[in-house]
């Protein structure tokens, strides 16, 4: 399941790069798969929010990106996530790259990267 989600994630990142005009030399944070969920590309100063993944959900390749961004740009018809919701994790895109997830997955979602590897 996670291999499939990772593959879908990479496809989604590629589509997002095209839509947002991102390339390897663009400033900002590249989209990434962090072994738990998929993070879309982001501009410096953007905060990206994601919902805790449903660990055993089969990814739907046609679904919209399940994130909400705060900053210069939004992507697609994203869900209206808010840090005041439970089960939401954020990362900031900084000049040094992505920040650590906050809260950590283990405290926001009840599981961590080690569980997703098994």
């Amino acid at each position: 399941i996670f291999k499939k989600e990772q593959a879908m994630c990479l496809e989604k990142i590629q589509r997002a790069n095209e839509l947002m005009g991102f390339n390897d030399s663009s400033p900002g944070c590249p989209g990434m798969w962090d072994n738990i969920t998929c993070w879309k590309p982001a501009h410096v100063g953007e905060m990206v929010l994601v919902s805790c993944p449903e660990l055993f959900r089969i990814f739907n390749p046609d679904q919209v990106w399940e994130t909400e961004t705060i900053g210069e740009s939004d992507f697609g018809d994203s869900n209206s996530l808010d840090l005041s919701d439970m089960g939401v994790v954020s990362r900031n895109c900084t000049e040094d790259g992505w920040s650590e997830p906050f809260p950590h997955y283990f405290d926001a979602c009840g599981f961590d990267e080690y569980e997703s590897e098994t």
Epitope: S84, P103, H104, D107
Partner: antibody, heavy 123, light 107 residues
């Protein structure tokens, strides 16, 4: 029914190491759905979370910054128990120490606690 | 660290009263908040988790509400066994800090 039974000395000399053990019955320290925590309560009644250990394919520990340089929480899978070691204690470490199980249901909460051990740091 | 501020620090009430205890977080913690009751010489006991969910076995006169930074614990029709100290605790991000406690005693 989950029960946590604490053991360890009630008096520790300054600069020495505080060691307490929490024996688990009705659950396993290797459970992949629980965390195992230590909390203390100072004489002023203030509760302070010290840290936790848990198993998810591998063992992980999280510690409070206030004690991070001095604390170790170790699981003992053979006895289904976990321990607290706090090094270089001072009288400010005098407190009632509790072990507790963390359970996940939308968030982590502490649903089963040990009976508490009063530890006095004094020469 | 996230600071948890509880008020009042103590209150006096009578059996049958409705009381409210408040807890404020130094930053938004969504609903990652728990309430515990502690009686002298005993360990804390979980009452409410996720701000408003009643722990199994806890009487329905206990209720919790709130989200973000402001939370309340309400006890409807206070019973003799409810005279105790109450603590809030955030589990949004370690270290999982507690409020200073509210002692409820008999008027």
């Amino acid at each position: 029914q989950v029960q946590l039974q604490q053991s360890g000395p009630g008096l520790v000399k300054p600069s020495q190491t505080l060691s307490l053990t929490c024996a688990i019955s009705g659950d396993s320290v290797s459970s992949n759905s629980a965390t195992w925590n230590w909390i203390r309560q100072s004489p002023s009644r203030k509760l302070e979370w010290l840290g936790r250990t848990y198993y998810r394919s591998k063992w992980s520990n999280h510690y409070a910054v206030s004690v991070k340089s001095r604390i170790t929480i170790n699981p003992d899978t053979s006895k289904s128990q976990f321990s607290l070691q706090l090094n270089s204690v001072t009288p400010e470490d005098t407190a009632v120490y509790y072990c507790a199980r963390g359970t996940w249901k939308q968030l982590w909460f502490l649903d089963h606690w040990g009976q508490g051990t009063l530890v006095t740091v004094s020469s | 660290d996230i600071q948890m501020t509880q008020s009042p620090s103590s209150l006096s009430a009578s059996v049958g009263d409705r009381i409210t205890i408040t807890c404020r977080a130094s930053q938004s913690i969504s609903r990652y908040l728990n309430w515990y009751q502690q009686k002298p010489g005993k360990a804390p006991k979980l009452l409410i988790y996720a701000a408003s969910s009643l722990q199994s076995g806890i009487p329905s006169r206990f209720s919790g509400s709130g989200s973000g930074t402001d939370f309340t614990l309400t006890i409807n029709s206070l019973q003799p066994e409810d005279f105790a100290t109450y603590f809030c605790q955030q589990s949004y991000s370690p270290p999982f800090t507690f409020g200073e406690g509210t002692k409820v005693d008999i008027k």
